[in-house]
């Protein structure tokens, strides 16, 4: 890939004195930018889902919306559930900031989190009975 030119004044990541901590401005620059209009895919999908508020004051962001599939099977055009197919969550690994030590206002540690962002319809795993 093409490396972006680095300011000569930037610290060297290989340096043993390279900081393990960084300053982060938590004021989001494009906070008020309208992201794509909220769609109703969660209802129209053949694997519909509901969104649930996951709130944790020890985390930034403190509120993350997660999807839960409504059905084990998938929904046909008439809204009936068909078990020849399965609804499964689409999961995405994200990075969040975890307060460390706990309850501290301005001290965080990066943490990986697996979140479900929606559901999709898949063919089931076929298991053969011996």
């Amino acid at each position: 890939g093409i490396a972006s030119p680095q300011n000569p004044g930037c610290p060297n990541a290989e340096d043993k004195n390279f900081p393990r901590t960084v300053m982060v401005n938590l004021n989001i620059r494009n906070r008020n930018t309208n992201s794509k209009r909220a769609s109703d895919y969660y209802n129209r999908s053949s694997s519909p889902w509901n969104l649930h508020r996951n709130e944790d004051p020890e985390r930034y962001p403190s509120v993350i919306w997660e999807a839960k599939c409504r059905h084990l099977g998938c929904v046909d055009a008439d809204g009936n559930v068909d078990y020849h197919m399965n609804s499964v969550p689409i999961q995405q690994e994200i990075l969040v900031l975890r307060r460390e030590p706990r309850h501290c206002t301005n001290s965080f540690r990066l943490e990986k989190m697996l979140v479900s962002v929606g559901c999709t319809c898949v063919t089931p795993i076929v298991r053969h009975v011996a």
Epitope: N80, D82, P89
Partner: antibody, heavy 120, light 108 residues
């Protein structure tokens, strides 16, 4: 009123067959996924099988796959469970249950149950 | 295969709050329902979709689900609440419904 009534239980020898029935009344039977759930004496609930509203798709628990068959007759508001090659561990009270229209993880109506005893 | 784990028994004094837990790997990503079963009777749905209460179920029954644990809470527990309580979800990998093995609630 809205109810499910099971029948067909009894004492049967290992290796033999039995057919359970569940009569539904008071609701639009043909619009619901239906299930069979069993409970061995003094034990936990165990899901057995389900059938979609139209009878075209079915799922089975591992312990009964290949031996039990679920079916339904929407014109008769009836659910069935054909049990073949019965084993002692199939001894249980068998309940038919209605799946909630709001999603699978809920059985919102249960029958009174019918006892199946597999013994020689 | 997926498993749901419940404590075998929970005891509570009348009028107090009873909490019955149900644990499973990443359970927050699944819907959980709860069933009450009194001796010699069929199970009755008391909570579905983690937190929802069917009509006819008293308001003292509530549910929650986060992390690896779903919880059924009965506030102001009454003698009539003494029963076995089962949690349930589904497992898409085995395409089956999964029950916990039940918790016997004793009202002292």
């Amino acid at each position: 009123q809205v109810q499910l009534v099971e029948s067909g239980g009894g004492v049967v020898q290992p290796g033999r067959s039995l057919r359970l029935s569940c009569a539904a009344s008071g609701f639009a039977f043909g619009s619901y996924t239906m299930h069979w759930v069993r409970q061995a004496p003094g034990k936990c609930l165990e899901w057995v099988t389900l059938i979609s509203f139209d009878g075209r798709s079915k799922l089975y628990g591992d312990s009964v796959k290949g031996r039990f068959t679920i079916s339904r007759d929407n014109s008769k508001n009836s659910l069935y469970l054909q049990m073949n090659s019965l084993r002692a561990e199939d001894t249980a009270v068998y309940y038919c249950a209605r799946g909630s229209v709001r999603g699978e993880a809920a059985f919102d109506l249960w029958g009174q149950g019918t006892l199946v005893t597999v013994s020689s | 295969s997926y498993e749901l784990t419940q404590p075998p028994s929970v005891s509570v004094s009348p009028g107090q709050t009873a909490s019955i837990t149900c644990s499973g790997d990443n359970l927050r990503t699944k819907y959980v329902s709860w069933y009450q079963q009194k001796p010699g009777q069929s199970p009755v749905l008391v909570i579905y979709q983690d937190t929802r209460r069917p009509s006819g179920i008293p308001e003292r029954f509530s549910g929650s689900n986060s992390g690896n644990t779903a919880t059924l809470t009965i506030s102001g527990t009454q003698a009539m609440d003494e029963a076995d309580y089962y949690c349930m979800t589904w497992d898409v990998d085995t395409t089956s419904m999964i029950f916990g093995c039940g918790t016997k609630l004793t009202v002292l």
